[in-house]
Every structure is written in C-alpha cells, then in structure tokens.
Interface confidence: low
C-alpha cells in the first residue's frame, strides 16, 4: 500500500481467483484514543472500533472511502483504490491501446518544435468518474523539471456503438535547450483513476523523436508563362523553431489528381518553392519534416490547381 | 579547412558533408539487425558517447560568439564515432557488406573530421572504450544503439554547419 496523495491510498493486488489479497491497517488521524468507530462509503454499518482498523482487501467491494467517527463527528477519511496485477502485468483497463507506432501504446506525444513544449494524448471509452494526473521529468535517476498542465477532454468521437474520449495535456521542459543533443529521455507518467480502480501509464521519449512540424503556411501557386508548369511557394510554419538557417526543414511537394488511383508526382526539396506541372482538377500539397533528423512529416497543406 | 588558432572552417563544404552524414546515418539504420530494439525503450545508459550539450556553444548565439568550442566538440564526436564504426563492433560477425551505408558513413565521418582539423593540429579527443571481441548479440545491440545515437549527433552537427554556412561564411 502506498499514498497517492493526502488521504488517498493505492493497494496493489495480485488478481486471480481465490487470491489472498492484502492486509491493510488504517489509522484514524486523531488524538482521540477511544470511542472511535469505522464505516465504509455511505453505509452506516460499523466495521470495527478503535484507533486502527485492520481489513483484508481482496476485491473492489473492499475498496472505497473508510471513515472514522466519534459520537457522530467525522474524524478522518482514507480512500482506498485498487491497482490490479493479473499474471504479473498491471491492468490497463482504463485507457485504450492506440496500437501506433506499436502495440501497448497508451500515451502518444508530439512536439511542434524543439522548444521543450510537447503535447500528450490518450483515449478511453469511459465517460464518468474518471480523473487523470500527469507528471513528467527529463531523466529518472536525477530528474530535471518538466511542468505539465491539467489533463483536459480534448475530443469526443463515435466509434461504432461506442463513444471514445480523447484527453490531452501540455507539458513544458523548465530549462529547455533546443540546440543541444538530448542524452536523457523525457519521462511522462499518467495516473488514471476510474471509480476505485487505479492504473498508471508511462511513456519515455526524446523530443527529437516526437517532432511533427505544423504544415507549411501561405501555400501559393504562380503560373509560369506559356507553360503547364506552376511555381509553388510556401513558408515555414509559425510554430517551427528559429532561426530557420539552424532549424531547417525539408519539404515534399505532391501533385494529386482527383482520383486516388491517379499517379502521384512527388518532388523533395530543401527550398520553399518548387516548379511542378499542374494537371486539370489536380491539387498540390506540401508537407514538412526536420531536414536532419527523420521524425514525423507534418500534415499536408493543399491548394487546388485551377 | 579549419585553421589552428580559431579561424573559420570551410562552412559550405562542412554543411554538404554533414548533410550527407545525416542521410547515411538513417540509411545505415535498417542494417543494424533484424529486430526493433525500440521495444526496450531508450533507457538512461552510461554516457560513454560524447553528446553536444547545452554549454558547448553549438546554439546560434554561441556560434556567433565563438564557434571554436562547438567545432572542437563536434570534432571529438566525429573521431569517437569514426573509431567505433571501424571497431570490431561493426567489422565482426554478422558482417556488413563492403559497400554498405556503414562503410560510407565511416569514410564520411573521417572526411568531415579532417575538414575540421588538418594535419599537424590536434584537438583533444575523447577516449574510445576498448571492448573485447564480442558476440553477435552484443554487436547487433551496440550497432543499433551507436547508430541511433549517431543520428542524433550528426543532426546537431548538420544544423551547426548549415547555420554557419548561411550566417558565418566569409
């Protein structure tokens, strides 16, 4: 058993049929010595008396808010949550496996630049009685500070018969050094509580590996005289790190016909313009990637050819 | 070429070669083994590999003030990786093809380090760990880790030379 926060405790249980459970001793936070009784949640049934209460925690029915009273007055509370371990593996019932980039990916994180700011998100089908708490650091043995905000509900989607909820959190490294080569990973820890179930999820990454630039901006076409060719130009996204002579991007320009089956023409360039042939009913798209490190491509920015 | 005493390197040549190094480091990566070792996470490891750190002056402001600190750091790293890529870790079984990107990467690391430091001028270089001849599982693991680490190192070096070529070239 360990303390998650003041008056909230997590009991770690091996979860299998007829498991013995864990013996837990609760102590009433009071100078009083006698006349103390204990109850669980809203029930008025007295579970025991005295300054301490010993309980055998085996299942969710044994978890909840234990309260000690004296003469009708509440003295203190202890909320017990359960953390299940099945066949040696901690339960992951609360969050959905996003399966990208690999199985057992519950947290996904992205950064728009090298400033030390990043966003993580996760999915769940649970709509109520759900709380999240996020902590982060750079490195784990001698951790350096990363400040995370509160997790918020950022999207709701319907997936078949189910509703899916996306939560996200923004974090910022306290003393970021955008130009340095990271040697210690960022660690992100999410505590999830659904009713009386506790679970924790972690992710470890380098900012360089989660970089995904915003799409290029101000995508424009300029027809070239007496030619089917056009000059496509664009700019670095506002959110990308500066100066651009240092934090350089590379670009992919694609000409795509109306039909998905039509052949795509692609050009790669380090410049912010390119000359391509504009076919009728086609569209031109441009996306960006860090020039020197193969992290994710941005989403496409597109304009029609006409 | 870099000249002892702190004058400028051939920024544009260094830019071109460092960008080539980035491409080679990423094309060499699939050759390091048949497994995805990212499963294991990038745990904190003993820092025997030289990293370009915050105080090394490799940021745009530091380069403007005095690029020599940063160039010396990059040179140290290039020599370190060049020696690693020439060691038993990469030359032993399971062997790589002679024309593999690793061989080209090895040559390019040497080329860039020579651009930064001509004959007769010696910056201090970091000691490379001496590793006894190792088994294939050890080599495969080390190749993967070394190339992952090299990708990050050459990315920073390439940014430095690109910025230098754009803003510090005579």
């Amino acid at each position: 058993i360990w303390e998650l926060k003041k008056d909230v405790y997590v009991v770690e249980l091996d979860w299998y049929p007829d498991a013995p459970g864990e013996m837990v001793v609760l102590t009433c936070d009071t100078p009083e010595e006698d006349g103390i009784t204990w109850t669980l949640d809203q029930s008025s049934e007295v579970l025991g008396s005295g300054k301490t209460l010993t309980i055998q925690v085996k299942e969710f029915g044994d978890a909840g808010q234990y309260t000690c009273h004296k003469g009708g007055e509440v003295l203190s509370h202890s909320l017990l949550l359960l953390h299940k371990k099945e066949d040696g593996i901690w339960s992951t019932d609360i969050l959905k496996d996003q399966k990208e980039p690999k199985n057992k990916t519950f947290l996904r994180c992205e950064a728009k630049n090298y400033s030390g700011r990043f966003t993580c998100w996760w999915l769940t089908t649970i709509s109520t009685d759900l709380t999240f708490s996020v902590k982060s650091s750079r490195g784990s043995s001698d951790p350096q500070g990363v400040t995370c905000g509160a997790a918020t509900l950022s999207a709701e989607r319907v997936r078949g018969d189910n509703k899916e909820y996306e939560y996200s959190v923004e974090c910022q490294e306290d003393s970021a050094c955008p130009a340095a080569e990271e040697s210690l990973p960022i660690e992100v820890m999410v505590d999830a509580v659904h009713k009386l179930k506790y679970e924790n999820y972690t992710s470890s990454f380098f900012i360089r590996d989660i970089i995904k630039p915003d799409p290029p901006k101000n995508l424009q076409l300029k027809p070239l005289k007496n030619s089917r060719q056009v000059e496509v130009s664009w700019e670095y996204p506002d959110t990308w790190s500066t100066p651009h002579s240092y934090f350089s991007l590379t670009f992919c320009v694609q000409v795509q016909g109306k039909s998905k089956r039509e052949k795509k023409d692609r050009v790669f360039t380090d410049k912010t313009s390119a000359t391509v042939i504009c076919r009728k009913n086609a569209s031109i798209s441009v996306r960006a990637q860090d020039r020197y490190y193969s992290s994710s491509w941005s989403e496409w920015a597109s304009v029609p050819c006409s | 070429r870099a000249v002892p005493g702190g004058s400028s390197p051939a920024w544009t040549q260094c830019q071109q070669l460092s960008q080539k190094l980035c491409t080679l480091a990423w094309s060499a990566h699939p050759l390091v083994g048949h497994m995805d070792l990212r499963e294991e996470g990038d745990e904190e490891t003993t820092n025997d590999v030289p990293h370009i750190q915050c105080g090394d002056g490799c940021d745009p402001q530091g380069l403007r003030d005095n690029s020599q600190f940063c160039l010396q750091r990059i040179h140290q790293g290039l020599i370190f990786y060049e020696k690693l890529l020439g060691s038993d870790i990469f030359t032993g079984e399971p062997s790589l093809l002679p024309d593999s990107p690793v061989a080209q990467l090895h040559a390019s690391l040497l080329g860039l380090s020579q651009l930064l430091q001509p004959e007769g001028h010696h910056w201090e270089t970091q000691q490379i760990p001496s590793l006894s001849p190792s088994q294939p599982w050890q080599r495969l693991l080390l190749r993967f880790k070394i190339l992952r680490s090299l990708q990050a190192f050459v990315a920073v070096a390439a940014r430095v030379f690109a910025h230098g070529a754009a803003t510090l070239s005579p």
Epitope: - | G33, M35, T46, W137
Partner: antibody
Framework: QVQLVQSGAEVKKPGSSVKVSCKAS????????ISWVRQAPGQGLEWMGG????????NYAQKFQGRVTITADESTSTAYMELSSLRSEDTAVYYC??????????WGQGTLVTVSS | DIVLTQSPATLSLSPGERATLSCRAS???????LAWYQQKPGQAPRLLIY???SRATGVPARFSGSGSGTDFTLTISSLEPEDFAVYYC?????????FGQGTKVEIK
C-alpha cells in the same frame, strides 16, 4: 583470473520480485558482457538475457521481456538480475556467466530461487 | 529464435568408448558461433568448445567439436569416468542466445 560470486539462496512468495547479484573480481568488468542463465529442477539451461556493463545496454529473451531487468554497477563490478511477478515455475537455479566471443567461459556458482506460497 | 535439437537424449556408454553427440539448428548458425558445455550434478556448466571447433582453455584433447551451418557434433574420443555428465550445445550467432535441451552421457 576472473571469478563471479553470486548472492545467496532466496525463498519468495508468488507475485513478488527477486534480485540476484553477481560480483566480478580479478578482471576488467567493463570489457565483457554478463549473461544470465537459469535452470529449473531437472531441466535444461535457459538464457534470460545479458548486459554490456560499459554501455549499460541490456538484451532480453522474448519470454522474459517486461519481467526481467538486468543492470550493472561498474563501480562495484556487480551485475544484477531482477525478476518480477514470480510464479512457482520460476523456481530455478540462476547463473551469471561472463559472455565473450568464445562463449560463456566463466560462471557464477548459481543462486537457488524458490517460489512458494 | 534458433531452435537447437540435441540427439540422442541419453547416451549409455562404457569408459574408454567413443561418444558422438549431435546438435542440429533450425536455421544456419552464422559464423559457426556454437559452443558446447558440460554440466555435472550440483555444478555450474563448464565451457568445452567455442566457435564450433575450438577447445576452451584447460579442456583435454579428447574433446573435439566439428560441423558448420546447421549440423554440429561433439566427440569424446575415449570416455573417462569424469566425462559422464550432461552436455549442452548453445548458439550465439543471433541477438537471442539459445541452448539445446541437453544430452545425458551415462555409464552403461
């Protein structure tokens, strides 16, 4: 002459963890790898994983991935193998061995781990 | 992972006889990174042969290893009383090391 000395026998409850140590003397600890091999009563040898102390890099057999953690402390020339979520079938003798190009040439004396409720 | 199959499971011979132990791999063992170990009851294994055919330090000349690719053999030219034990082959040519299930050489 390199010698590997392992920690003593352990009795553990199902669901708990065990951490076995392996101290090297008489050689340069960092220059080679340490592998961990186990042997259940009356059974054969089973490789669990290994570590290259100089780099801190570990490699695990798929079967133990997520349950085993192999670490090394260069300052004390000691390697460690921690196995979590123990079950009765983890009852075995656990060996550490120096792992060089010529195979596992030096072995520890073995540590018996008994998992029983 | 490479699976190593040893045969026979048990070999019953008398001192002075020749013992031939076989180890077959499910796929080619790169660089012939194959080792043989001897294990006696209550003891740690002992390295006999590495690289398929090289004798480890202090191993008597009666022990020899041969083979390449997927088929390997350990030969004990003339069994001594102290040679009765279990013998394991092991491949270390891949990221994941594997052992054979063992061959027990017992006194007939």
């Amino acid at each position: 002459q390199v010698q590997l000395v392992q920690s003593g026998a352990e009795v553990k409850k199902p669901g708990s963890s065990v951490k076995v140590s392996c101290k090297a003397s008489g050689g340069t600890f960092s220059n080679y790898a340490i592998s961990w091999v186990r042997q259940a009563p009356g059974q054969g040898l089973e490789w669990m994983g290994g570590i290259i102390p100089m780099f801190g890099y570990a490699n695990y057999a798929q079967k133990f991935q997520g349950r085993v953690t192999i670490t090394a402390d260069e300052s004390t020339s000691t390697a460690y193998m921690e196995l979590s979520s123990l079950r009765s079938e983890d009852t075995a003798v656990y060996y550490c061995a120096r792992d060089i190009y010529a195979g596992m040439d030096v072995w520890g004396q073995g540590t018996l781990v008994t998992v029983s409720s | 992972d490479i699976v190593l199959t040893q045969s026979p499971a048990t070999l019953s011979l008398s001192p002075g006889e020749r013992a031939t132990l076989s180890c077959r791999a499910s796929q080619s063992v790169l660089g012939n990174y194959l080792a043989w170990y001897q294990q006696k009851p209550g003891q740690a294994p002992r390295l006999l042969i590495y690289g398929a055919s090289s004798r480890a330090t202090g191993v008597p000349a009666r022990f020899s290893g041969s083979g390449s690719g997927t088929d390997f053999t350990l030969t004990i030219s003339s069994l001594e009383p102290e040679d009765f034990a279990v013998y394991y082959c092991q491949q270390y040519s891949h990221l994941i090391i594997t052992f054979g299930q063992g061959t027990k050489v017992e006194i007939k």
